[in-house]
Interface confidence: low
């Protein structure tokens, strides 16, 4: 049923009225306003921005706007004792030092409080030793080094290039390999697109540009000192030694000019293959240590950053629902940035601001959504998704009972090629239907729908004539809502052409050069892509909050469950002998998926023809839809990852950014051939199949007729 059938809606106040109110010019103006100074989490500047947003959301017409503060562990460089890396000679003299800051972009030379590049939460330390180049520091890179090349990283400082996987996974892998320090750098192969100039003349990374970022392995814990509970006034805090997810070895990021100086002297083993070579004019030797004449020189890190409990502020705005005020649809994105935040996060925050303004305009004209909409400006996302996680921990009982959906709103763009959507399968049909109603902003698709340009440029690998929609992983503020609480979630942004631009993220990500001008000059001068993203995010929120029957299709979950079961079975079948020896069977899982498919199909039939005028029956059916995502939550969580509780999806154990399906089974099977005790390892596979099969069956039963 269409949105404008909802109670208290005049024909004027339908989805079209909401979308028509969204203006590209406003998004541009808001982006400019949010990017003139740094808004680092825990700083006075970011507190002032929180209060400004609170004030403006009130003016826009929300019913209430509150600040929610928490005292969480953050990390900052020491202002009087800068971090850097040296090459030292045999006498211990520093013969080369990396730069202490990025050269500021034009027009920003006099801006104060630009935090120098650092790896947030690095411990202090001054390790020195031989260098080992570890490619991207992925699990498979260390397998290559240790198993194939017999290179031991123990006691070495490793240098890894950014890209492919979350930096925290790189650090964890280096720690497990015994390294005593990690240097992260941006290689032009990953952060310099051919044929494009460096900033300020283009959107590429200059040699002095550096990617900041946290290096935690929180696995969904939130504040490292208060896992599972909000970091409020009466919180019990762990000691720093017991804190969750902190790295144990010093880590520091550098740009490719400085990396060149370290890598050009590398000796030892040659790179194993071309996939280990970047684009610098260096041999990409693995090491350990420097070559020939330089063999007595070592690398020394000087890291003096400190971890400090600091106050952060979320802004939470409420637009009360007219019919179901106890059902929450949440739109949230973060406000804190590493420096100016031109793309991350303010291109997203500006879109949220305009969405709030449009909803507020409708509300001032007498309209209300059917369900309550919550708007959130999260703090400290860059330090480990802390603001969103602490708020969700504080409100978990309300959220698990009342949370309908969460739509994430970080960076609106990471390119200007086509749409990118990651979401729960429950939202596939919502996204498809919405994008068919929106105009494409793409050149060559004038007068065509967004669905058409998106499908053409990013086709689904499985279903012809449909666009690609990816699994949710992590690395953003939806994590606690989806992976921990089981609230249906989605995210949308404009992205690059992954076929032709194989660099990781966008080149200026988390650097000082991520400015308003970067967006206005090079990515989206007309702000038409921002407007399209506002329409997608806002349109999803509108439908979720306003449609009489929730716009979730449980049959799409059935389809992906079968696909994921097939995939994990095929992985297991790489070990047919062991499956036979240890009596490993996937029958229970396939049976549960079959049952889910049948029950979902029957539920969908009932959904077509029940009496929507009966509020009790309507609420009952909607609750079955709302709680379906919740049914995939295992209260015990995944092994060693208690805050990742979704049985169907979790962030990959090897890359936080990526989603993995049936993660419990996947992790149990991973590298199983090298396990010392195969009986125990295959026993764990069987246990994980059991958990997955039970969960799918239990979820199916929530869709059965209630009596």
């Amino acid at each position: 049923k269409s949105s404008n059938e909802a109670t208290n809606i005049t024909p004027k106040h339908n989805m079209k009225a909401f979308l028509d109110e969204l203006k590209a010019e406003n998004i541009k103006k808001f982006l400019y306003n949010f990017t003139q100074i740094p808004h680092l989490a825990g700083t006075e500047q970011n507190f002032q921005l929180a209060k400004q947003i609170q004030s403006q959301w009130k003016e826009f017409g929300l019913d209430s706007v509150e600040l929610a503060h928490y005292d969480v562990l953050l990390s900052y460089p020491n202002k009087t004792h800068p971090n850097y890396i040296s090459i030292i000679n045999e006498d211990g003299n520093e013969i080369f030092n990396t730069s202490l800051f990025e050269p500021p972009p034009p027009g920003y030379e006099n801006v104060s409080d630009i935090v120098p590049p650092f790896s947030a939460f690095s411990p202090q330390g001054m390790p020195e030793g031989d260098l080992v180049y570890v490619n991207y520091a992925r699990t498979e890179d260390f397998f290559k080094l240790e198993r194939d090349m017999k290179i031991n990283c123990s006691g070495k400082i490793v240098i890894a290039r950014y890209g492919k996987v979350f930096r925290g996974n790189k650090v964890k892998n280096a720690q497990l390999a015994g390294a005593k320090g990690v240097i992260l750098y941006s290689d032009p192969a990953d952060y310099f697109a051919p044929g494009v100039k460096s900033y300020p003349d283009g959107w590429n990374l200059p040699g002095g540009g550096v990617q900041r970022g946290n290096i935690l392995n929180l696995n969904g814990a939130g504040d490292p000192l208060t896992p599972g509970y909000p970091a409020n006034e009466y919180a019990y805090r762990r000691g720093i030694a017991e804190a969750v997810g902190l790295p144990s070895i010093p880590v520091h990021p550098i740009g490719y000019y400085d990396a060149q100086k370290l890598l050009e002297k590398m000796g030892g083993s040659a790179p194993p293959d071309s996939s280990w070579r970047g684009s610098l004019k260096v041999p990409y030797n693995v090491g350990p240590g420097f070559t020939g004449n330089f063999s007595t020189q070592k690398v020394k890190m000087h890291i003096h950053s400190t971890n400090e409990v600091t106050r952060i502020y979320n802004v939470i705005g409420t637009l009360r629902g007219a019919v179901e005020p106890d059902r929450y649809v949440i739109l949230g994105g973060h406000r804190d940035s590493w420096v100016f935040g031109g793309i991350d996060p303010q291109s997203g925050a500006a879109v949220v601001h305009e969405i709030v303004r449009s909803f507020g305009t409708l509300k001032k004209e007498g309209w209300r959504p059917r369900r309550t909409i919550l708007f959130a400006s999260w703090d400290a996302e860059e330090f480990g998704l802390l603001g969103s996680t602490e708020w969700a921990e504080e409100n978990s009982r309300l959220l698990q009972e009342r949370g309908v959906a969460y739509i994430n709103a970080d960076s609106s763009i990471e390119g200007n090629y086509t749409l990118r959507v990651d979401c729960t399968p429950l939202m596939y049909s919502l996204v498809h239907n919405l994008t068919k109603e929106l105009k494409s902003p793409d050149e060559g698709f004038e007068g065509k729908s967004l669905y058409e340009s998106w499908t053409k440029k990013s086709p689904s690998p499985e279903f012809s004539g449909m666009p690609r929609i990816s699994k949710l992983g992590s690395g953003n503020d939806f994590e606690v809502f989806f992976q921990r609480l089981g609230i249906a979630s989605g995210r949308a942004r404009y992205t690059k052409n992954w076929e032709t631009n194989k660099f990781s993220g966008y080149p200026l990500y988390h650097s000082v050069y991520e400015t308003y001008e970067l967006v206005e000059k090079f990515y989206d001068p007309m702000f038409k892509y921002h407007l399209t993203v506002a329409q997608v995010r806002g349109g999803m929120v509108f439908e979720l909050a306003n449609s009489i029957v929730l716009p979730f299709d449980c049959r799409d979950y059935a389809v992906v469950l079968r696909k994921y079961a097939d995939k994990i079975y095929s992985i297991s079948m790489k070990h047919p002998q062991e499956m036979k020896t240890y009596s490993v069977s996937f029958d229970s899982l396939f049976s549960a998926v079959k049952n889910f498919t049948e029950i979902a199909s029957k539920f969908s039939e009932r959904l077509q023809d029940f009496d929507k005028s009966n509020p009790i029956v309507l609420r009952m059916m909607n609750d079955q839809l709302m709680f379906l995502e919740r049914a995939f939550i295992d209260p015990l969580g995944l092994p060693d990852r208690p805050f990742y509780r979704h049985v169907i999806y979790a962030p990959s154990s090897h890359n936080k950014y990526a989603g993995e399906s049936f993660p419990g089974i996947y992790d149990a099977l991973f590298d199983i051939e090298s396990k010392v005790d195969p009986s125990k390892a295959w026993g764990e596979v069987k246990r994980q199949i059991y958990v997955a099969a039970f969960t799918v069956q239990a979820a199916a039963e929530t869709l059965s007729e209630v009596a």
């Epitope: 092994p639 060693d640 764990e684």
Partner: antibody
């Protein structure tokens, strides 16, 4: 049935070191936290240290922090306690314990204990 | 640190008696409390976990109750094999502290 078998106890001089081991058999320990608890002669129980299932996180009583290190080797199903700078007040029977992940019970299974005597 | 105070420190009872041991925490520990039984020269044995859940193989005459700061272990009908020392322990916040013990002796 889960069985825990401690070893490595004995007589050691003050300032010396010992490494205790605890071998687990029966059931899966993949997802279980493990612990050391000690009991001085004629006294009550005192928690010493805890380690997470993957070994990523460890926790210590203030009385042993900086001197003792808990670790585990999941491939060998073995828990360890490295005890350095031993003092007379560390004299005790040391028990290793394991949680029961399936039921959520902490300190569900206990070993029979190994005696550590610190004396000159 | 959270202090756990057991009472009484010792008690004398006869076979068939109903015995109650209490344990008080110095701050709220929700339901994160275990009870153990220890016989001389033996390792402690888990009786009750998470305040009221009977551990595997423990007879049903043992029961636990409470929440927050005040907890009780009850033996509904004391048996000869129940004469031992009983400990409570909180595992809400590290350090995971034990009570000082309650010795149940034959009257």
């Amino acid at each position: 049935e889960v069985q825990l078998l401690e070893s490595g106890g004995g007589l050691v001089q003050p300032g010396g070191s010992l490494r205790l081991s605890c071998a687990a058999s029966g059931g899966y320990s993949f997802s279980d936290y493990m612990h050391w608890v000690r009991q001085a002669p004629g006294k009550g129980l005192e928690w010493v240290a805890t380690i997470s299932s993957g070994g990523s996180y460890s926790y210590y009583a203030d009385s042993v922090k900086g001197r003792f290190t808990i670790s585990r080797d999941n491939s060998k199903n073995t828990l360890y306690l490295q005890m350095n700078s031993l003092r007379a007040e560390d004299t005790a029977v040391y028990y290793c314990e394991k949680d029961n992940y399936a039921t959520g019970a902490w300190f569900a299974y206990w070993g029979q204990g190994t005696l550590v005597t610190v004396s000159s | 640190d959270i202090q756990m105070t057991q009472s009484p420190s010792s008690l004398s009872a006869s076979v068939g008696d109903r015995v109650t041991i209490t344990c008080r925490a110095s701050q709220d520990i929700r339901n994160y409390l275990n009870w153990y039984q220890q016989k001389p020269g033996k390792a402690p044995k888990l009786l009750i976990y998470y305040t009221s859940n009977l551990a595997s193989g423990v007879p049903s005459r043992f029961s636990g109750s409470g929440s927050g700061t005040d907890f009780t272990l009850t033996i509904s009908s004391l048996q000869p094999e129940d004469f031992a020392t009983y400990y409570c322990q909180q595992y809400w916040i590290g350090p995971f502290t034990f009570g000082q013990g309650t010795k149940v002796e034959i009257k």
